[in-house]
């Protein structure tokens, strides 16, 4: 049903839903400071153009009493609870940032009449792409996909002369949130992966992963894993690895491989890791500092989320436009907007943009390198290093299947 | 241009206080986390303390933490820097300083502008 916003007569409202199932375990004291700090920014800017209008944020809590496993397994009801309450008290802003489960975000999208537009830090899977008034701040799998498959068809580059068509994936059902969809992603046979891969297979049990580190009659030399160094250690350990194995693990928010004295462990040898650029956001600062990385980055994203809303408000008061509009609430896509750390990019679909990276281990000075890097809006690869000192053969990558020759 | 200036400084007792303020001309004045720094005669000028954009962030150097605090109104284009219980190490001249993005920072190269600096003198 329609409910009516606070949002009109130079007074503008934020729901900020926050949920006991979450995409990270952040204590919801870390998000308020975040959106706190946001809002103050966004006042500043929106005084500074000479727009003299209020803003504030009304943090819409769940009461928890069904619905606690506190991870997004019992998320796609709290989100419609949560709604409801919002229905009840009439509290709708004119925006909704929230939802961050991909469960709660696709039953949110799909159960309410959306005519105000909703901003995630998370809902990573599939079924939340081509939203027309969804905007996700964290990338989501489609990203992801679109980057291996890309890097998988590269055969162009001195470090990468093979063109790959096969892989493994190790998904055992343990992930975080965000590793579970993108792995689910890659793992759906109809999904932009599956479909320019010739051979796929998923790896469920420990042993299987182990088992194909030095199977003769492997089908891929190419693993993809999701999670950070300790839970690929915890899988591998020190067991042997066949010399044409390369495992690519993706740890998107995770920016430690860049700090300074950080030393790759031996295991890390066979490994190439897929992580974000960390552009500005700066490992020592006060923000980050109480933060596990993910976690850094789900803040960050709720604050971005803030940063976006007072970008959007400020064009289209600038041009004498209504805010509680379907074109106020398609807007939230196409566009660059300044975020807490720059510039920040969403797509056609409202879906961030970003630089990704692919790292390698030095057996030289044992550090993390970028290989290349990766921009998702052009869906376009950059190589960096064009003589890493790999652990393969001749410094290149080798071939996806063992035993065949030049592609 | 952006510019810095700093103001309160002077001569004070041991255990005395002091409030240091830092006026700006960047505008909007939300989007800088601002910095304090201060220098020594024969040191390299050192972090003292930082605030984010919206004033929610803030960091300080051990050696003052507990006795300085930060804080910021953005709408007087402001960073202000109340130092209590002050020793004679902390004689030095202070320096405020816009960060190039709104987090909270305290490494120099983080930094883009800075003011001329006001002299603080702890006398025991």
């Known amino acids: 049903s329609q409910v009516s916003q606070n949002c009109h007569n130079g007074s503008y409202e934020i729901s900020v839903l926050m949920m006991g199932n979450s995409a990270f375990a952040e204590p919801l004291k870390n998000l308020e400071d975040a959106v706190n700090e946001g809002l103050e920014i966004v006042r500043g800017r929106l005084q500074n153009a000479g727009l003299n209008v209020t803003v504030n944020a009304t943090f819409m809590y769940s009461d928890g009493l069904i619905h606690n496993s506190g991870d997004c397994r019992s998320s796609t009801c709290e989100g419609l609870d949560l709604l409801r309450k919002i229905s009840n008290a009439q509290r709708m802003g004119c925006v909704l940032i929230g939802p961050s489960c991909t469960y709660s975000t696709f039953q949110m999208y799909l159960d309410t009449e959306l005519s105000y537009p909703m901003i995630s830090a998370g809902s990573f899977g599939l079924s939340c792409d081509y939203k027309e008034t969804l905007t996700r701040l964290m990338s989501p799998a489609r990203k992801l996909m679109y980057f291996l498959v890309n890097f998988w068809k590269t055969n162009d580059l001195p470090f990468k002369t093979y063109s790959w068509s096969t892989s493994y994936v190790y998904k055992n059902g343990t992930e975080t949130e965000d590793c579970f969809w993108y792995l689910n992603a890659l793992e759906a046979s109809v999904s932009y992966f599956s479909h320019e891969l010739g051979f796929k297979v998923v790896l469920r049990q420990d042993k299987e992963f182990q088992d194909i580190l030095m199977d003769h009659n492997r089908k891929s030399n190419v693993i993809i894993m999701c999670g950070g160094p300790e839970f690929l250690y915890k899988l591998k350990g020190d067991r042997a690895v066949a010399e044409d194995i390369v495992i690519i693990l993706v740890d998107l928010f995770n920016d430690q491989y860049f700090e300074d004295n950080v030393t790759a462990p031996d295991y890390m040898k066979n490994v190439l890791v897929l992580t974000l650029s960390p552009g500005n956001s700066l490992l020592n600062s006060s923000f980050s500092r109480n933060l596990s990385p993910t976690k850094r980055d789900f803040a960050l994203a709720y604050l971005n989320g803030i940063l976006l809303f007072g970008h959007m408000l400020k064009i289209f008061l600038e041009n004498g436009e209504n805010i509680t509009t379907p074109k106020f609430a398609h807007a939230f896509r196409n566009l660059t907007f300044e975020g807490y750390d720059g510039p920040v990019t969403l797509d056609d679909w409202g879906d961030v943009d970003s630089t990704m990276v692919l790292l390698y281990t030095s057996v030289d000075t044992k550090k993390y390198k970028v290989l290349l890097t990766y921009d998702t809006h052009v869906n376009k690869t950059y190589p960096v290093d064009m003589s890493p000192t790999f652990t393969w053969k001749n410094s290149k990558l080798p071939n996806d299947i063992t035993g065949r020759g030049p592609q | 241009q952006v510019q810095l200036v700093e103001s309160g400084g002077g001569l004070v007792q041991a255990g005395g206080s002091l409030r240091l303020s830092c006026t700006g001309s960047?505008?909007?004045?939300?989007?800088?986390?601002m910095g304090w720094f201060r220098q020594a005669p024969g040191k390299e000028r050192e972090f003292v303390a930082a605030?984010?954009?919206?004033?929610?962030?803030?960091d300080f150097a051990d050696a003052v933490k507990g006795r300085f605090t930060i804080s910021r109104d953005n709408a007087k284009n402001t960073v202000y820097l109340q130092m209590n219980s002050l020793k004679p190490e902390d004689t030095a001249v202070y320096y405020c300083?816009?960060?190039?993005?709104?987090?909270?920072?305290?490494?120099?190269?983080?930094?883009?502008?800075w003011g001329q600096g006001t002299q603080v003198t702890v006398s025991s």
């Open positions: 960047a505008r909007p004045f939300s989007n800088y986390g």
């Open positions: 605030i984010s954009g919206g004033g929610v962030y803030t």
């Open positions: 300083a816009r960060a190039r993005t709104a987090r909270v920072v305290s490494r120099r190269h983080e930094y883009d502008y």
